[in-house]
């Protein structure tokens, strides 16, 4: 039997179990250099010389329930939120800083999910439906990844999901939100 696929705010039900390395998204912000933002310094391209491992990409743990329309996981799941500015740590603003110290004019990097893990959850539904098992895809690690010019930011992470098939002996439920709406919320977390 196939696993039903659906999107959650920060999760996705998946058909297979395992770890999922993600190819780097082909994206770019397409922003131009602004000297005022750069503190009047000459253009600097830190990403051309610095190793990606030096960039600050934080993995923040957070806990939430998986939802599908009126259904909700019996228990919350814990996953990572990718956070942070993907620039060399020495150039990032500290706690006292009042804004960006620089904006790279070269390739744009973002802190986004790198690997995923699958976890089974138990989904509880109202209205006399029996609980059922689902596999959900959770962020397992984050990485600074290069964005290219071909796509806009709204497509930063667009998982493909198949439409949910109605279960036998049960009425199909309307989706709570569209995949795109969930995607936008997911991206805003970054």
């Amino acid at each position: 039997q196939g696993w039903q696929a659906f999107k959650n705010d920060a999760t996705e039900i998946i058909p297979e179990l395992g770890e999922y390395p993600e190819p780097p998204p082909e994206l770019e912000n397409n922003k131009t250099m602004n000297r005022a933002e750069n503190g009047g310094r000459p253009p600097h391209h830190p990403f051309e010389t610095k190793d990606v491992s030096e960039y600050s990409c934080r993995e923040l743990h957070f806990t939430r329930y998986v939802t599908d329309g009126p259904c909700r996981s019996a228990k919350p799941v814990t996953e990572l939120v990718c956070s942070g500015q993907c620039g060399p740590a020495r150039l990032l603003p500290n706690a006292i800083g009042r804004g960006k110290w620089w904006r790279p004019s070269g390739p744009d990097f973002r802190c986004i999910p790198d690997r995923y893990r699958a976890q089974r959850v138990q989904l509880l539904c109202p209205g006399g439906e029996a609980p059922r098992a689902r596999k959900v895809r959770l962020v397992a690690s984050c990485k600074c990844k290069r964005l290219t010019r071909f796509h806009n930011q709204s497509e930063l992470k667009d998982f493909g999901t198949e439409a949910a098939r109605p279960q036998k002996g049960r009425k199909p439920r309307p989706r709570a939100r569209s995949a795109k709406a969930n995607q936008a919320e997911l991206e805003n977390a970054y």
Epitope: W3, K75, Q122, L124, G127, E129, A130, A133, Q167, K171
Partner: antibody, heavy 124, light 108 residues
Framework: QVQLVESGGGLVQPGGSLRLSCAAS????????MNWVRQAPGKGLEWVSF????????YYADSVKGRFTISRDNSKNTLYLQMNSLRAEDTAVYYC?????????????????WGQGTLVTVSS | DIELTQPPSVSVAPGQTARISCSGD??????VHWYQQKPGQAPVLVIY???NRPSGIPERFSGSNSGNTATLTISGTQAEDEADYYC???????????FGGGTKLTVL
């Protein structure tokens, strides 16, 4: 107090049919999900079927799918299990069980009250 | 479906603590229920949703569930606790209520 009384069990030949009943009392029957669970002689428990309070959702174990049909008559406070194409491996004590629900989502849907069971023997 | 595995038997001296395990892949993400069944009788729910006791069940019965193992704990075990114990949970992709194989608790 809550009472569940099963009936309709007996000896039947392989390929035959039988209809089990479960008379409920002591609670608002139509508000509760009900289940059938069976236990072969000397073996463990096996869930058979589930029906929601308004009969809109029914589920079955793979072992009985297509052969058994669960239904209910809320006006009579009675749960049924129609068993067709019976096999020797269907021989068991059949229990009807009320599902315990709490909170908006019902919780994990455990079975808080059970009948005493009715024995179904499939043999030639 | 997730298979639920229980030890066939557990023995305990009166007054001691009995622990019955129920293992299954990531069962900690699922609500687990425990049933007690004495010979010739119908099952009785003793723990629901991992660690909740129905009314009328003695306080010595408790449950926990984490990772790959759910556990039923009976503190100060009494002779009347001798019975078969089953764990269970809705673990199917299409709803399926799965019982563990059962554990026979013997009070020595």
């Amino acid at each position: 107090q809550v009472q569940l009384v099963e009936s309709g069990g007996g000896l039947v030949q392989p390929g035959g049919s039988l209809r089990l009943s479960c008379a409920a009392s002591g609670f608002t029957f139509s508000s509760y999900v009900m289940n059938w669970v069976r236990q072969a002689p000397g073996k463990g428990l096996e869930w058979v079927s589930f029906i929601s309070g308004d009969s809109s959702n029914t589920y079955y174990a793979d072992s009985v799918k297509g052969r058994f049909t669960i239904s209910r008559d809320n006006s009579k406070n009675t749960l049924y299990l129609q068993m067709n194409s019976l096999r020797a491996e269907d021989t068991a004590v059949y229990y009807c069980a009320r599902t315990f629900m709490h909170g908006h989502l019902g919780g994990g849907l455990s079975m808080d009250f059970w009948g005493q069971g009715t024995l179904v023997t499939v043999s030639s | 479906d997730i298979e639920l595995t229980q030890p066939p038997s557990v023995s305990v001296a009166p007054g001691q603590t009995a622990r019955i395990s129920c293992s299954g892949d990531n069962i900690g993400s699922f609500y687990v229920h425990w049933y007690q069944q004495k010979p010739g009788q119908a099952p009785v729910l003793v723990i629901y949703d991992d660690n909740n006791r129905p009314s009328g069940i003695p306080e010595r019965f408790s449950g926990s569930n984490s990772g790959n193992t759910a556990t039923l704990t009976i503190s100060g075990t009494q002779a009347e606790d001798e019975a078969d114990y089953y764990c269970a949970s809705w673990t199917g992709v299409e709803p399926d209520y799965v019982f563990g194989g059962g554990t026979k608790l013997t009070v020595l």
